[in-house]
């Protein structure tokens, strides 16, 4: 009988304790927001906000500029000064709640928890490969704003998500804010609004469209806006909120809200419940039919998918898919099954489901008892009637009012529970060659880069490494700059190559040479490495 090499178990062919050091920046305080900019030439920047300060970094994560954004009322606050001599409100620290790019100008817009949640606009001025912030413009016109009607009050201290869309020659800010009774009473931010930036950068145009949680529900019904993005003809917000206005407010679920990106109006505002489940291949006795629900979205990202995953999802390569990491409850604590699951929702399918829901509500024959929903935003009504009305009047259209689609969109965990005890806190998805890779940050400060495939009973790791020694959670928002992703953990920003930090965690030559082509791994004497790490022979074709 022929002798054969003993088979190395898959798990023994890699070592996730291998230390990788990636470039980092110490921000001097807990990172609150981060955004990246890449210009037409090779100028680029990373903007990092901490309490009372905004850092501008070059592509090498070296500091280019640093601006004091607070405390409000402090003479050293460089942004506050843009609003003219104060006082403009109660003194206090500025926590950055919004940090977004307006690509049309281009400009950076930052909005904080102080000064009624107003925003500041900084034109981006390139200088070589770096980018600088011009002097800030205060997006607040005192004479246009009142506590009950404040177009320039954008950020809520409880959290705000913003997506900027260019329409014609104007920039529209799609804003979603978490509210409670106290916040709603102070300069009235809205739950969802679309605001046009005035051409003279003096603030936002009055008379903007908005939806808000009705005063009677503000105490018990809170909406957390987890993510927002723009793709195709729509802007989407992802929320975690109570499943019902009337039932237990701690029974949460996840919704997708869709707004038109081409018309700045809210008549076609639609919501759809997203249902993500863990359905083990062998169902335990007593486990729920259809799988265990994971109703609470923790993080999300949308991206076009590679060929392999596209085939598994029965969609075309390059189509946009919304990926979400879900947990069982707010604390994300352990139950039966994994701590985190990942579900994939193709955007075209989401749109189709929403459109079908509108047809069910508005096209006769309408199913009796079908509710328009969104009772926290509007008066209850049955389809096809407008909110609060018993019937449609001849000059109104059923379609011109917000609607909760009556069916939900259900998906199962792409990783088949294989994330196990890992608590995922950050997610960014990229397409590399024909492979779709999920770049995930974890509660204990690690980065997992894993191929997104369904059909396996093990995870295909590009990498799994610790960002540093602090072990602090990786924060929700991830940004891309060129071929790198920027993750924040504690007071640090880390720059992680999308093709992985290296190859040293592959321990055997066989495993090394089976690594994805984009990783650039080869066998180097007695270790797996990239060509630049190998002064001697470097072999990508065969093992010694």
């Amino acid at each position: 009988e022929d002798w054969q090499c003993p088979r190395t178990p898959y798990a023994a062919s890699r070592d996730f304790d291998v230390k990788y050091v990636v470039p980092s920046f110490s921000a001097g305080g807990l990172v609150q927001a981060m955004v990246t900019y890449e210009g037409d030439r090779n100028e680029s920047a990373v903007f990092v906000a901490i309490r009372n300060r905004l850092h501008v970094l070059g592509p090498d994560l070296k500091s280019v500029q640093s601006l004091a954004t607070g405390p409000a009322g402090d003479p050293g606050c460089q942004t506050c000064a843009a609003c003219g001599p104060g006082p403009h409100g109660p003194p206090g620290d500025t926590d950055t709640k919004v940090l977004v790019l307006d690509p049309a100008l281009p400009a950076l817009v930052s909005c904080g928890s102080s000064l009624q949640g107003r925003c500041f606009l900084h034109d981006l001025e390139p200088q070589g490969t770096a980018v600088h912030l011009a002097a800030p413009a205060c997006l607040f016109s005192a004479h246009h704003n009142r506590p009950d009607d404040c177009p320039d009050c954008v950020a809520s201290p409880l959290g705000t998500r913003v997506t900027v869309v260019e329409q014609g020659q104007a920039s529209y800010f799609y804003v979603a804010s978490s509210l409670d009774a106290a916040v709603a009473a102070s300069f009235s931010p809205r739950s969802v609004s679309i605001r046009r930036l005035k051409a003279d950068a003096s603030g936002f145009a009055p008379g903007f469209v908005a939806l808000s949680v009705l005063p009677k529900h503000l105490v018990s019904y809170s909406i957390e806006y987890v993510h927002s993005f723009h793709t195709g003809a729509f802007v989407y917000f992802l929320t975690v909120q109570p499943a019902s206005v009337t039932d237990d407010p701690s029974a949460l679920h996840t919704r997708l809200a869709r707004l038109s990106a081409t018309e700045p109006e809210l008549g076609d505002y639609r919501e759809l419940v997203l249902d993500c489940r863990f359905a083990p291949k062998r169902r335990r006795r007593g486990a729920p039919e259809g799988g265990q629900p994971y109703p609470v979205l923790r993080v999300a990202h949308s991206a076009p998918v590679g060929a392999q995953l596209a085939t598994e999802l029965s969609i075309a390569e390059g189509q946009e898919v919304l990926f979400g990491v879900f947990v069982t409850g707010k604390d994300g604590g352990p139950g039966v099954g994994p701590n985190s699951v990942v579900c994939a929702f193709p955007i075209d399918l989401l749109d189709t489901l929403i459109d079908e829901g509108v047809e069910r509500c508005c096209e006769s024959p309408v199913h009796p008892g079908l509710r328009r929903g969104l009772d926290f935003f509007q008066s209850p009504s049955f389809c096809p009637n407008p909110p609060g009305l018993e019937a449609l009047s001849p000059n109104t259209s059923c379609r011109h009012f917000p609607l909760l689609v009556s069916s939900s969109f259900s998906r199962v965990d792409l990783f088949n529970g294989l994330l196990g005890p890992v608590q995922v806190t950050a997610l960014y998805v990229t397409r590399l060659d024909n492979v779709t890779v999920a770049h995930m940050g974890t509660m204990d400060g690690r980065i997992l880069q894993v191929e997104l495939v369904r059909s396996l009973n093990y995870l295909l790791y590009v990498s799994n490494f610790s960002l540093g020694d602090s072990g602090q959670p990786v924060q929700r928002d991830v940004s891309r700059l060129g071929d790198h992703l920027l993750f924040a953990s504690g007071d640090q920003v880390f720059q992680v190559p999308i093709q992985g930090p290296g190859c040293r965690h592959f321990l055997t030559c066989g495993r090394c040479l089976r690594a994805w082509h984009f990783m650039g791994c080869g066998w180097c004497g007695n270790m797996c490495g990239q060509q630049k790490e190998c002064p001697g022979s470097w072999q990508q074709d065969h093992c010694p």
């Epitope: 500029q65 070589g128 600088h132």
Partner: antibody
């Protein structure tokens, strides 16, 4: 040493157009904004506008907007300012000046020697 | 546009004197202010940026102060080569605007 060298003096008739050049050396034109400044005889300085040669993005003073065009030729590291529909009050010295960020703040750190434009019938 | 008002428009001083020139902005400009020196027939030269920072190669007898709307250029001990015209400039908003200038003459 960074240098900005401007073209020579010009005499023009009212209604004509003048185009002044500013050739830079010892730095890359595309890396910094280039500004143009007017100084009428015995008067102060007035900012006309600027260009970022890397992207050709321009910004003008409203006072000059209808008559001025600022351009750059990156192949020759030269910036240009063209002023049309000349009138006698355009008689002045015109300077090109590079602006650069120093930390958080910007300033015009290098200037050309100036070009005298005389408008006379 | 932001107006920059410089005063005095001219002053006479002797070598060794302490000279102060002020500049008032019509609205707050933080510290987005520069000072330039111009000699007859020459281009302006940058002295101070960010209201208080000395440009490379500028003698330490020059200093700048102020923020918001009120700014000052001080020459602690006037030297013969300092007789010139001085301009402030705001770089907070375009159009960038200059003060009217202060001519420092020999007494």
């Amino acid at each position: 040493e960074v240098q900005l060298v401007q073209s020579g003096a010009e005499v023009k008739k009212p209604g004509a157009t003048v185009k002044i050049s500013c050739k830079v050396s010892d730095y890359t034109l595309t890396d910094f904004y280039m500004n143009w400044v007017q100084q009428a005889p015995g008067k102060g300085l007035e900012w006309i506008g600027r260009i970022y040669p890397g992207t050709d993005k321009t910004r003008y003073n409203e006072k000059f907007r209808d008559r001025v065009t600022i351009t750059a030729d990156t192949s020759t590291d030269t910036a240009y300012m063209e002023l049309s529909s000349l009138r006698s009050e355009d008689t002045a010295v015109y300077y090109c000046a590079r602006s650069a960020y120093y930390g958080n703040y910007v300033a015009m750190d290098y200037w050309g020697q100036g070009t005298t434009v005389t408008v006379s019938s | 546009d932001i107006q920059m008002t410089q005063s005095p428009s001219s002053l006479s001083a002797s070598v060794g004197d302490r000279v102060t020139i002020t500049c008032l902005a019509s609205q707050t400009i933080g510290t987005w202010l520069a000072w330039y020196q111009q000699k007859p027939g020459k281009a302006p030269k940058l002295l101070i940026y960010a209201a208080t920072s000395l440009a490379d190669g500028v003698p330490s007898r020059f200093s700048g102060s102020g923020s918001g709307t009120d700014f000052t250029l001080t020459i602690s001990s006037l030297q013969p080569e300092d007789f010139a015209t001085y301009y402030c400039q705001q770089l907070y908003n375009t159009p960038w605007t200059f003060g009217g200038g202060t001519k420092v003459e020999i007494k």
